[in-house]
């Protein structure tokens, strides 16, 4: 059964920058991918981007860059201009369409641990400082003890006693033993820095295999649309958009001027043509 996975991540360097990764696990060719936020496509969600495998991509603010990562996965970078960081609590949905076989959609959101307000990196700092203080204190005590022992040994050395030589040898051994814990403490001091990862996500996330990423099919839905086709050609599109509410094509921000339902298309605002001479409707 085809499955769609969705992963939302926050950039560790820029807390206002988010990336949505989506992938399709299953047979068949993808004809179109739509990314929306606030809910599934066609069910209250607002489209952020549409990606066609051949003809390119289209996106709407706050989407910054939509691109194909593999033949079956995409990524969408988002720029959060607001200080309140609304993306943290937003659901992102990805819909993979394979016309006319069907479409599959799944949704996901930013993991709570990645929320800037709940982020872990600021907290290890005091912990590391406490460790540092403890280690330095222990090292100081050990060093003081070693120094004091050396001082005692030197005092004994100056006395005319025939048993001084063995004591001197023992002092060297004792000194080495006293330093061993200190060196271990130094290693312990560096260990926290080596083992604590303050990054929110793997550095190689873009190149990781989709199967290795978290799949969050929390709102997964399969919408079979039409019989399976023996030869399906990828299809999708670039241009302006029409806001459709309750089955009505209507200009964004406006209500239909009539009381009855209708299909009112508003002027096109599409960009340059992505492909010249493509087979299609003319």
């Amino acid at each position: 059964t085809p499955e769609v996975w969705v992963q939302v991540q926050m950039e560790a360097t820029e807390l206002s920058s988010f990336t949505v990764h989506c992938g399709f696990l299953g047979p068949g060719s993808i004809s179109l991918v739509t990314v929306s936020w606030g809910g599934p496509d066609g069910a209250g969600g607002t489209k952020l981007a549409v990606l066609h495998p051949e003809l390119g991509t289209r996106q709407w603010a706050p989407a910054r860059q939509a691109r194909w990562e593999t033949q079956s996965s995409i990524s969408l970078a988002l720029e959060d201009s607001g200080a309140s960081s609304p993306f943290a609590n937003t659901t992102f949905c990805c819909k993979f369409a394979s016309f006319p076989e069907g479409s599959w959609e799944s949704c996901g959101s930013l993991p709570p641990s990645s929320d800037p307000g709940l982020s872990a990196p600021p907290t290890p700092v005091p912990i590391l400082r406490a460790d540092l203080a403890g280690i330095l204190g222990l090292s100081g005590v050990l060093l003081f003890g070693c120094g004091y022992l050396l001082h005692l040994l030197r005092r004994q050395k100056h006395r005319p006693t025939p048993r001084l030589q063995p004591s001197h040898t023992n002092s060297q051994a004792l000194t080495a033993q006293a330093w061993a814990p200190s060196q271990a403490s130094q290693a312990a001091l560096h260990d926290p820095y080596a083992t604590i990862n303050t990054s929110f996500c793997p550095a190689t996330l873009d190149t990781a295999h989709p199967n290795g990423w978290a799949s969050l099919p929390t709102h997964a839905a399969h919408q079979p649309q039409g019989p399976a086709a023996s030869a399906s050609t990828p299809i999708l599109a670039r241009g302006s958009f029409v806001s459709v509410e309750n089955g009505l094509y209507t200009q964004a921000g406006e209500r239909p001027p009539h009381t009855g339902p209708g299909l009112t298309l508003f002027p096109d605002c599409r960009g340059p043509r992505a492909v010249e001479g493509r087979f299609g409707v003319r």
Epitope: S31, L32, T34, D41, G42, A43, G44, G45, T46, K47, V50, H52, L55, G56, R58, W60, K95, A97, F99, P100, S103, Q225, I235, L236, A237, R238, G239, S240, F241, V242, S243, V244, E245, N246, G247, L248, Y249, L265, F266, P267, D268, R270, R273, A274, V275, E276, R278, G280, V281, R282
Partner: nanobody, 121 residues
Framework: EVQLVESGGGLVQPGGSLRLSCAAS????????MGWFRQAPGKGLEGVAH???????RYVDSVKGRFTISQDHAKNSLYLQMNSLRAEDTAVYYC???????????????WGQGTMVTVSS
């Protein structure tokens, strides 16, 4: 939930006419175009006609002058009037709502179950 329901298909003799209808409901999406695709038995998909966001109808060369695409705002429906039908027009016809990546192509984002049109004597 988005729903596109086609009707009007059937068996017709060469040279005859049919009118396909598509009832759209439950839409809350940004889209660019509405149109018709078809898939002949054992063949690939073909865009037949669509209406852009600018309201201008566009047709594939093989149906120009024979097919007419239109909308009925009151009924929230899309139609395809097919005249002078030929055997090669035999196919499953799908009503689609989609996006434009270039002027000539309406890429389906949602579509109906399809309706079969058979042109045969």
């Amino acid at each position: 939930e988005v729903q596109l329901v086609e009707s009007g298909g059937g068996l017709v003799q060469p040279g005859g006419s049919l009118r396909l209808s598509c009832a759209a409901s439950g839409y809350t999406s940004r889209t660019d175009c509405m149109g018709w695709f078809r898939q002949a038995p054992g063949k690939g998909l073909e865009g037949v006609a669509h209406i852009d966001s600018d309201g201008i109808p566009r047709y594939v060369d093989s149906v120009k002058g024979r097919f007419t695409i239109s909308q009925d705002h009151a009924k929230n429906s899309l139609y395809l009037q097919m005249n002078s039908l030929r055997a090669e027009d035999t196919a499953v016809y799908y009503c689609v709502v989609g996006f434009k990546f270039d002027e000539d192509y309406c890429a389906p984002n949602d579509w109906g179950q399809g309706t079969m049109v058979t042109v045969s004597s």
